[in-house]
């Protein structure tokens, strides 16, 4: 039950995170005009990854797309790439994790396969979250550098006199959305990886016990899936007993086509 909850929660958290990453990527407010100490200009500028916008004081807003690819800063291109990779990985991860959910039965899919898929989606979510966090952080670093450069430029010149009134940009809402969303996706991925460990039946350390049935003496070997095999093809480690003493939790957690309880 705990495994199902962990997996389900990981899926939901990742879903919210990826939705946030998509939202952040599409948002126009990655950088916004710094309005500290009263607005300097009568227009409010803000920029996204795909277009820049200007809001007139009347409320009229005009946005212009960056209709060039080569003319854009390399850093911006890198941020775009990181966010897109994050979205793609997250989307694939979501698709995989839907089929991996314990509460959804698809044909006679083994738990080993579900565990495999859960781990795969978990890793994808982690990488997706890291891509988003990296993308947002690169952009934030770019803003901080430009902010202090423009601040320095404002006070250089003859006798420290203000020579130019520069429009400085600060963190926009999209950055915070991106950081939170990336974090959620990362957490969701970790939860999926934790759930995967629970989905995979681990090898028990019971000593071999001989049960003497009437008529024949049959040895029952302890077995189970070896955790170390990484949930691959399970030819060597099939259970070779038809029944045996096991806990109720084991019965619930690891049913497979070889178990007839």
């Amino acid at each position: 039950m705990a495994v199902t909850a962990c997996q389900g929660l990981g899926f939901v958290v990742s879903l919210i995170g990826i939705a946030g990453i998509i939202a952040a990527t599409c948002m126009d407010q990655w950088s916004t005009q710094d309005l500290y100490n009263n607005p300097v200009t009568a227009v409010f500028n803000y920029q996204g990854l795909w277009r820049s916008c200007v809001r007139e004081s009347s409320g009229f807003t005009e946005c212009r797309g960056y209709f060039t690819l080569l003319g854009l800063p390399a850093m911006l291109q890198a941020v775009r790439a990181l966010m897109i990779v994050g979205i793609v990985l997250g989307a694939i991860g979501l698709l995989v994790s839907i089929f991996a959910l314990k509460c959804i039965r698809i044909g006679s899919m083994e738990d080993s396969a579900k565990a495999n898929m859960t781990l795969t989606s978990g890793i994808m979510f982690i990488v997706s979250g890291l891509c988003a966090i990296a993308g947002v952080s690169v952009f934030a670093n770019m803003l901080v550098t430009n902010f202090w450069m423009s601040t320095a430029n404002m006070y250089t010149g003859m006798g420290g006199m203000v020579q130019t009134v520069q429009t400085r940009y600060t963190f926009g809402a999209a950055l915070f959305v991106g950081w939170v969303a990336g974090g959620l996706t990362l957490i969701g991925g970790v939860m999926m990886c934790i759930a995967c460990r629970g989905l995979a039946p681990e090898e028990t350390n019971y000593k071999a016990v001989s049960y003497h049935a009437s008529g024949h003496s049959v040895a029952y070997k302890p077995g189970g899936f070896k955790a170390s095999t990484g949930f691959g093809s399970n030819t060597k480690n099939k259970k070779i007993y038809d029944g045996g003493a096991r806990t109720e939790d084991e019965v619930q957690s690891y049913p497979s086509k070889h178990d007839y309880v």
Partner: antibody, heavy 119, light 113 residues
């Protein structure tokens, strides 16, 4: 059509205050900024400040802070500018002007109020 | 504050002539976000309030005759009247409507011979 009605003249004594009105009609009063501009006799134009009638948000020219106070009465679609501690230097024509929607320019102007400060 | 410098003043011309007046700002009025220059031109006829002619440096206000043309970018702007008419007798002001406080030039007085 857009109209901004201002009283023609205001005669005030030095040290006193005056409240110049600007009645707007022909448009949605709360949508556009209302600007105030002064022009001394034979001189150029000087921006005093602006007020947004919807929420009374305002921006002032630092030079006129303390001298001019901008207010609005949404119920009567009227903008006001109060001028305090008047001196003969404040004798001028005061215009109200409606801000444009697409740009920050002043699309429509009132006829102006001539404020004369004299003992 | 942004200083707007207008020249020449006064400007005496004969009707039908082409007139060019200039306006320089102490700082660029170009907003990189939308590539627009926040400079406005007003016409003030004697005894009247100013009238909006051109905004965004080159966009003519509706109802303004097409003989009025605004041009320029950054810090240098011009207002051109292609064929001056007697009714164009006025003072022309340029205005910075980008930086606070909004500032006007001293004006160019157009006189007709």
């Amino acid at each position: 059509q857009v109209q901004l009605q201002q009283p023609g003249t205001e005669l005030v004594k030095p040290g006193a205050s005056v409240k110049v009105s600007c009645k707007a009609s022909g448009y949605t009063f709360t949508t556009y900024w209302m600007h105030w501009v002064t022009q001394r006799p034979g001189q150029g134009l000087e921006w005093i400040g602006r007020i947004r009638p919807s929420d009374s948000d305002s921006n002032y020219n630092q030079k006129f802070k303390g001298k001019a106070t901008l207010t609005v009465d949404k119920s009567s679609d009227t903008a006001y500018m109060q001028l305090n501690s008047l001196t003969s230097e404040d004798s001028a024509v005061y215009y109200c002007a409606m801000g444009a929607y697409f740009s920050n320019s002043f699309a429509y102007w009132g006829q102006g109020t001539l404020v004369t400060v004299s003992a | 504050d942004i200083v707007m410098t207008q020249s020449p003043s006064p400007l005496t011309v004969t009707a039908g002539e082409k007139v060019t007046m200039t306006c320089k700002s102490s700082q660029t009025l170009l907003n990189r976000g939308n590539q627009k220059n926040y400079l406005t031109w007003y016409q003030q006829k004697p005894g009247q309030p100013p009238k909006l002619l051109i905004y965004w440096a080159s966009t003519r206000e509706s109802g303004v005759p097409d003989r009025f043309t605004g041009s320029g970018s950054g810090t240098d702007f011009t207002l051109t009247i292609n064929s001056v008419q007697a009714e164009d007798l006025a003072v022309y002001y340029c205005q910075n409507d980008y930086f606070f406080p909004f500032t006007f030039g001293s004006g160019t007085k157009l006189e007709i011979r």
